[in-house]
Interface confidence: low
């Protein structure tokens, strides 16, 4: 079948990195600069992606594969194939339309991207708070009082104290 197809369509003989040039009697011509063909039998080469502005080049374009972009420092990729770059924030912050904002009290973000998430509610699992949460870290839940052996000192949940100067938003 392949042999028959190639007799009927001479373009099928053109390998990746070339295109079937109708203007030159269907000769396989190399892709021009800044273009590529990742499969054989192509009648045109695709224009290479250019990593501009906030995008930077992770992999250069070759005649057989497109360029791949990532983001300049301070930004991270979003979307398939890094179609967008979004500004990084610090841990303990989230990105809003007005820039990076501190997580509200009772929430945390341990990454430079994404949104602030509520602290784990230890009591839902019948556990107590072993370590307080912060803007950057979730609470650590400890064993429930029932899990403690008789005579052992129970773990008292510390009272949640506001961080100095940090008001809820």
């Amino acid at each position: 079948f392949e042999r028959t197809r190639s007799l009927q369509d001479p373009c099928s003989n053109c390998p990746a990195g070339t295109f079937c040039d109708n203007n030159r009697n269907q000769i396989c011509s190399p892709c021009p600069p800044n273009s590529f063909s990742s499969a054989g039998g192509q009648r045109t080469c695709d224009i290479c992606r250019q990593c501009k502005g906030v995008f930077r080049t992770r992999k250069e374009c070759s005649s057989t594969s497109n360029a791949e972009c990532d983001c300049t420092p301070g930004f991270h990729c979003l979307g398939a194939g890094c179609s967008m770059c979004e500004q990084d924030c610090k841990q303990g912050q989230e990105l809003t339309k007005k820039g990076c904002k501190d997580c509200c009290f009772g929430t945390f973000n341990d990454q430079k991207r994404g949104i602030c998430r509520p602290w784990t509610n230890c009591s839902l699992d019948g556990k107590s708070v072993l370590v307080n949460g912060t803007k950057e870290r979730d609470v650590v839940c400890g064993p429930s009082p029932a899990d403690l052996s008789p005579g052992a000192s129970s773990v008292t949940p510390p009272a949640p104290a506001r961080e100095p100067g940090h008001s809820p938003q």
Epitope: C51, R56, T57, T72, K97
Partner: antibody, heavy 116, light 115 residues
């Protein structure tokens, strides 16, 4: 810390060319683009062109026929060349780092006077 | 090319006053994909290169005091300086940097003078 240092001539004759080197430190040219901007005496800022981190360039259409920007990543140098200079090209020329959303660090500027 | 129009071209204020300057673009600088406005503000003092003040229309650079506020979206943008200090004496430029609309262009500048 991040720095961009420019070197180039101060006086050029009409019809001659201008070459400026922008040597950067504190960051890699494989991670950031570098723009060129000029400022004529008493006037505002005019964007001339850019070389992106991957090596591709974009130019202001008004200068595309006589402007060339290139770079040497290993030497952390960006090269700016403008041909066919006339008196109205007299200006301060700056290189500046692209940070995505703005030009966050600028060179000290190269003063060019085009005069015979 | 996108045309950036700044107003007023100059203004003189007394230290401590509030100042508002405007920048209007001939095309929208709002990118619907990420809701970012590709507009920056620069401050240029006499004999110095410009300094990036605000990007994304409203996000202050780390060195910028919070008396500087950028606002606006689409085609209309504002830079406000509340409680002007003597060291704010400078020319302020807006610039579009939407990569889909090359060339990047700057406004004509607003010169801030202190009485």
């Amino acid at each position: 810390q991040v720095q961009l240092k420019q070197s180039g001539p101060g006086l050029v004759q009409p019809s001659q060319s201008l070459s400026i080197t922008c040597t950067v430190s504190g960051f890699s040219l494989t991670s950031y683009g570098v723009h060129w901007v000029r400022q004529s005496p008493g006037k505002g800022l005019e964007w001339l062109g850019v070389i992106w981190s991957g090596g591709s360039t974009d130019y202001n259409g008004a200068f595309i026929s006589r402007l060339s920007i290139s770079k040497d990543n290993s030497k952390s140098q960006v090269f700016f060349k403008m041909n066919s200079l006339q008196a109205d090209d007299t200006a301060m020329y700056f290189c500046a780092r692209d940070r995505g959303g703005g030009f966050d660090y600028w060179g000290q500027g190269t003063t060019l006077t085009v005069s015979s | 090319d996108i045309v950036m129009t700044q107003s007023p071209s100059s203004l003189a204020v007394t230290a401590g006053e509030k100042v508002t300057m405007r920048c209007k673009s001939s095309q929208s600088l709002l990118w619907s994909v990420n809701q970012n406005n590709y507009l920056s503000w620069y401050q240029q003092k006499q004999g110095q290169p410009p300094k990036l003040l605000i990007y994304g229309a409203s996000i202050r650079e780390s060195w910028v005091p919070d008396r500087f506020t950028g606002s606006g979206s689409g085609t209309d943008f504002t830079l406000t300086i509340s409680n002007v200090h003597a060291e704010d004496l400078a020319v302020y430029y807006c610039q579009h940097n939407h990569g889909s609309f090359l060339p990047y262009t700057f406004g004509g500048g607003t010169k801030l003078e202190i009485k």
